[in-house]
């Protein structure tokens, strides 16, 4: 017998063909021999089965000897062996209906787990293979679990259910609620204005929640809240700002913070957390601030950086248009009795300049 796989909620067409291409009598019955539909004269008649209100046939194809049965809004319990009786012959079609659904909301926070559950008819032994938008393949039986969602898991997941060498494909749209970046570092000279931006990696029509930027300054013994805010239908309103520094926040998305000036005492790491309506848990983005200061005091020219820098970064003091350079993989460099001229302090990573500050050394007479 023929096997047909169907998807819960979809429509399936079970075909039945007569050898003669003409309108003739036919009946569709289920395995309990209960009539579902058939032809009487020129009219479609329906039997007492549970399918009667969802079953139909293409009348336009009857005179071509095609007596298919269409079942709309498929249910798992529609799985059965259906018998088509035409021209004194019986054709059996086994219909297996499957459903694949996410156990929870399909809008999930980064780091949360996604579980896909397969609904299948009794006696079936299907296998499921899912492919994420990023190309990750996951296999399973009745359930498929993705323990920790990543932002690249956002998009359409394609899942293939296989049974008796037949397949049916499901598409599930998953939205991973996360910031576009897990972490970002801002490099600034002392006194410059600092802009922090926290773009989201998703769009929702209605976005309501609240958040906080929690900051650990390198020079401080403990961390503290820099700003708290609410988000109502994508409009940002500040709740509380620390007195020092006096941060400013944009009123619209993306979340945007301005620090009037970069100072060594502000250098450090922050964590912006955002709680969203109807979600358990919070979105996080780490942000780092590195501040550079170049100073001349008496016969000493010093360049310092504060904040989270990796040990492989190089700090250099260099006299413009001259070869004089001092470099260190450290957070401070200095030159004693520097030559007069324009000196550059450079923070670089494998030759790429991340931060630069110029200081003019005047000749001492």
């Amino acid at each position: 017998k023929k096997v047909v796989l169907g998807k819960k909620g979809d429509t399936v067409e079970l075909t039945c063909n007569a050898s003669q291409k003409k309108n003739t009598q036919f009946h569709w019955k289920n395995s309990n021999q209960i009539k579902i539909l058939g032809i009487q004269g020129l009219f479609l008649t329906k039997g007492p089965s549970k399918l009667s209100d969802r079953a139909d046939s293409r009348k336009s194809l009857w005179d071509q000897g095609c007596f298919s049965m269409i079942i709309k809004n498929l249910k798992i319990e529609d799985s059965d062996t259906y018998i088509c009786e035409v021209e004194n012959k019986k054709e059996e079609v086994e219909l297996l209906v499957f459903g694949l659904t996410a156990n929870s909301d399909t809008h999930l926070l980064e780091g949360q787990s996604l579980t896909l559950t397969l609904e299948s008819p009794p006696g079936s032994s299907p296998s499921v293979k899912c492919r994420s938008p990023g190309g990750k393949n996951i296999q399973g039986g009745r359930t498929i679990s993705v323990p920790q969602l990543e932002r690249q898991d956002s998009g359409t997941w394609t899942c293939t259910v296989s049974q008796d060498q037949k397949t049916v494909e499901f598409k599930i749209d998953i939205v991973v609620l996360a910031f576009q970046k897990a972490s970002s570092t801002v490099y600034k000279k002392e006194g410059e204005q600092v802009e922090f931006s926290f773009p989201l990696a998703f769009t929702l029509e209605k976005l309501t929640g609240s958040g906080e930027l929690w900051w650990q300054a390198e020079r401080a013994s403990s961390s503290k809240s820099w700003i708290t805010f609410d988000l109502k239908n994508k409009e940002v309103s500040v709740k509380r700002v620390t007195q020092d520094p006096k941060l400013q926040m944009g009123k619209k998305l993306p979340l945007h913070l301005t620090l009037p000036q970069a100072l060594p005492q502000y250098a450090g790491s922050g964590n912006l957390t955002l709680a969203l309506e109807a979600k358990t848990g919070k979105l996080h983005q780490e942000v780092n601030l590195v501040v550079m200061r170049a100073t001349q005091f008496q016969e000493n020219l010093t360049c310092e950086v504060w904040g989270p820098t990796s040990p492989k970064l190089t700090l250099s003091l260099k006299l413009e248009n001259k070869g004089a350079t001092v470099s260190k993989q450290a957070k401070a460099v200095w030159v004693l009795n520097p030559e007069a001229g324009m000196w550059q302090c450079l923070l670089s990573d494998s030759g790429q300049v991340l931060l630069e500050s110029n200081i003019k050394v005047v000749p001492t007479w």
Partner: antibody, heavy 119, light 107 residues
Framework: EVQLVESGGGLVQPGGSLRLSCVAS????????MSWVRQAPGKGLEWVAN????????YYVDSVKGRFTICRDNAKNSLYLQMNSLRAEDTAVYYC????????????WGQGTLVTVSS | DIQMTQSPSSVSASVGDRVTINCRAS??????LAWYQQKPGKAPNLLIF???SLQSGVPSRFSGSGFGTDFSLTITTLQPEDFATYHC?????????FGQGTKVEIK
């Protein structure tokens, strides 16, 4: 180690005054909002008042407005609650707490000082 | 003022039980909710902030959830040291307000 130590509680007659003090240590006091919270015997917690880092903003629960004044002296790492026109219903253990937790939570509390208003 | 209503007012449970305490705000408070534990004669101790984040040093058997008006605190496997009174508190708008407290007692 963060520490908050309250003092100044005691027995006072209705209509009388009392000044509670809270001395903070182990953190930069001038960087945090501070609160007073009270708890009447056998009852729940009731937030009384709080003040901004520099003392410029102050908020009170309605039942104490006009009678209680919260203030701070950052040079002395101290928080105060001046309580005037005391009533029997002000009888409670008064706690000083730091609003230093994430999401505006009260992360450190003192041991409390008992204020009894009775004739 | 925002009223905070805790339920139940007391709960009798045994060591190993799962206990859930609810807290309802009279108006939406987003995630501006904290949970505190208080033992007799002691000051309250912060457990949960921002409705669902665990304070550093607090055992992972404690968890919080909710947003807007309905919140809950769950202790998955009750330990002997968890018998105490639990308070919820909103920090959405002044005056800050607390629930009336829920006493977790030994059955």
């Amino acid at each position: 180690e963060v520490q908050l130590v309250e003092s100044g509680g005691g027995l006072v007659q209705p209509g009388g005054s009392l000044r509670l003090s809270c001395v903070a240590s182990g953190f930069t006091f001038s960087s945090y909002w501070m609160s007073w919270v009270r708890q009447a015997p056998g009852k729940g917690l009731e937030w009384v008042a709080n003040t901004k880092e520099d003392g410029s903003d102050k908020y009170y629960v309605d039942s104490v407005k006009g009678r209680f004044t919260i203030c701070r002296d950052n040079a002395k790492n101290s928080l105060y609650l001046q309580m005037n026109s005391l009533r029997a219903e002000d009888t409670a253990v008064y706690y000083c707490a730091r609003e230093g937790g994430q999401w505006l939570a009260l992360d450190y509390w003192g041991q409390g000082t008992l204020v009894t208003v009775s004739s | 003022d925002i009223q905070m209503t805790q339920s139940p007012s007391s709960v009798s449970a045994s060591v190993g039980d799962r206990v859930t305490i609810n807290c309802r705000a009279s108006q939406g408070i987003s995630s501006w909710l904290a949970w505190y534990q208080q033992k007799p004669g002691k000051a309250p101790n912060l457990l949960i902030f921002g409705a669902s984040s665990l304070q550093s040093g607090v055992p992972s058997r404690f968890s919080g959830s909710g947003f807007g008006t309905d919140f809950s605190l769950t202790i998955t496997t009750l330990q002997p040291e968890d018998f105490a009174t639990y308070h919820c508190q909103q920090a959405n708008s002044f005056p800050w307000t607390f629930g009336q407290g829920t006493k977790v007692e030994i059955k």
